[in-house]
Interface confidence: medium
């Protein structure tokens, strides 16, 4: 807390300018009018204040706006944003995408800080849903943003926003998140032709059900192994050898290198060895010839 001291004669700041960098902390506190600071916040960024001086400026704004800063001030915070705590930010009502962009720019190139996470949370909650522009802005600054959301939060993403999603944005998504995003992507890309549709939908396929994978296998898509390995195990298990062969096309040879990893390992266990042998890859572990395959899940459902 800076002590209240009278401003020395002739030191009262008529505007926010470079001369203030020579002011001691107590002089800034005494000689800079908080209302003036609020109206000239856009100038603060151009002046090389020390961290200690910025603390004083923040303190003045906190006193002027105990209930939280207005957006006109927030938009021009610049590097002063880095001084804010999540508690400060929870008092704000940020509605403008331009304000959000301005503050994200300050933190650009760094990991998402608690302050930024709080800011985004406030902004998205205020909007009610993750619209195209917001999603596009957030993924531009933080490519992993989408995958940091819970499935519940992702459910507010409208299908139209999926167009703004890039393959890199989904790198860290888990199956539960892709379960939510996949149907939205399917809807968003439904009017595209076959080959373009497949490439666009590919990064979302970790959420695809068996019937969609079966349909894709009829479309000559040549799925790569990296994509196949990210598919849901429960969606892959019911696929026949012929369907997997069609789905992977020339990439089917890669199954051999992945035979010990899920979902390939579990899928092999469900196939007849005869059928696996038709691939000519030397895959082992299928159901031996002559054995009867019982679908225990069906049996349980009937009993």
């Amino acid at each position: 807390e800076v002590e209240k001291t009278a401003c020395p004669s002739g030191k009262k700041a008529p505007e926010i300018d470079e001369s203030l960098i020579f002011y001691k902390k107590w002089e800034l506190e005494a000689c800079v009018d908080a209302a003036l600071l609020a109206t000239q916040m856009d100038r603060v960024n151009a002046i090389p204040f020390t961290y200690e001086q910025l603390d004083v400026l923040k303190h003045k704004l906190d006193e002027l706006y105990p209930q939280g800063y207005p957006e006109s001030v927030i938009q021009h915070l610049g590097y002063l944003f880095l001084k804010m705590s999540p508690e400060d930010i929870r008092k704000w009502n940020v509605t403008s995408l331009e304000t959000l962009k301005a503050l994200l720019e300050v933190n650009k190139g760094h990991e998402m800080s608690p302050q930024v996470a709080t800011l985004i949370d406030r902004f998205v909650k205020g909007r009610g849903q993750l619209d195209k522009d917001t999603l596009d802005t957030l993924t531009a600054f933080y490519p992993g943003y989408l995958c940091s959301l819970s499935p519940e939060e992702l459910s507010s993403v409208p299908p139209s926003s999926i167009w703004a999603v890039r393959p890199q944005d989904l790198d860290t998504c888990d199956p539960r998140q892709l379960d939510v995003l996949y149907p939205k992507a399917r809807l968003a890309f439904q009017n595209m032709n076959g080959s373009e549709y497949f490439v666009k939908i590919q990064s979302f396929l970790g959420g695809a059900p068996t019937e969609d994978l079966k349909a894709l296998s009829q479309q000559n898509v040549s799925m790569d192994l990296a994509t196949f390995m990210k598919l849901r195990t429960d969606a892959v298990l019911p696929l026949t050898v012929a369907e997997v062969q069609k789905l992977l096309g020339p990439h089917v040879e890669g199954l051999k290198a992945e035979e010990r990893h899920r979902p390939v390992r579990d899928w092999i266990l469900r196939q007849r060895q005869d059928d696996l042998d038709t691939l000519g890859l030397g895959l082992q572990g299928g159901i031996p010839n002559g054995y009867l395959v019982l679908d225990l899940s069906m049996q349980e459902a009937l009993s």
Partner: antibody, heavy 116, light 108 residues
């Protein structure tokens, strides 16, 4: 069929601004990104940025921030790129392209020449 | 950003000769998002292959594409006169999208 028709050649003075257009036909304009690409004589292709007409969302190559500005008019299915503070380095052919999963369709290009 | 380096920058081949040009990425690119374009003087680029190995509509079967990770190539099994052009590789995987510097293919 899908077509992208670009505006005609421009001869500009240094320091001026120019607005290029790209009219799309044959597909749902709002649903695909429009990409802008620069090609200087004898040089390769350089991505400037993109706009998604349905939302107005834009992404810019860092190098062209402040130089290029994208807009789109969904009523006329036309995308625009404004280039500001032109210098001789901006003399080039500028292409628009439609991107779904790749740049499948390209405009014929607009030649911009900057000369005093 | 991902830098794509094409080699050679210029090459000449006789009619009927097998031609291979390469594209090396500074970091890994999914094969689904690596594409090639052909450009002839005075014309716009044309999509030539998509997702590494798929030929675009109207592209002759003598062309083939292959590769994965950071190394990709475009091959012509038997050079024909109409193949003389500049070929660009392009990644649409990680923004900013980038193109290689191009390989100019001439007839010897």
């Amino acid at each position: 069929q899908v077509q992208l028709q670009q505006s005609g050649a421009e001869l500009m003075k240094p320091g001026a601004s120019v607005k290029l257009s790209c009219k799309a036909t044959g597909y749902t304009f709002t649903g695909y990104w429009i990409e802008w690409v620069k090609q200087r004589p004898g040089h390769g292709l350089e991505w400037i940025g993109e706009i998604l007409p349905g939302s107005g969302s834009t992404n810019y190559n860092e190098k062209f921030k402040g130089k290029a500005t994208f807009t789109a008019d969904t009523s006329s299915n036309t995308a625009y790129m404004q280039l500001s503070s032109l210098t001789t380095e901006d003399s080039a052919i500028y292409y628009c392209a439609r991107a779904g999963a790749w740049f499948a369709y390209w405009g014929q290009g607009t030649l911009v020449t900057v000369s005093a | 950003q991902i830098v794509l380096t094409q080699s050679p920058a210029i090459m000449s081949a006789s009619l009927g000769e097998r031609v291979t040009m390469t594209c090396t990425a500074s970091s890994s690119v999914s094969s689904s998002y690596l594409h090639w374009y052909q450009q002839k003087p005075g014309s716009s680029p044309k999509l030539w292959t998509y997702s590494t190995s798929n030929l675009a509509s109207g592209v002759p079967a003598r062309f083939s594409g292959s590769g994965s990770g950071t190394s990709y190539s475009l091959t012509i099994s038997s050079m024909e006169a109409e193949d003389a052009a500049t070929y660009y590789c392009h990644q649409y995987h990680r923004s900013p999208w980038t193109f290689g510097g191009g390989t100019k293919l001439e007839i010897k």
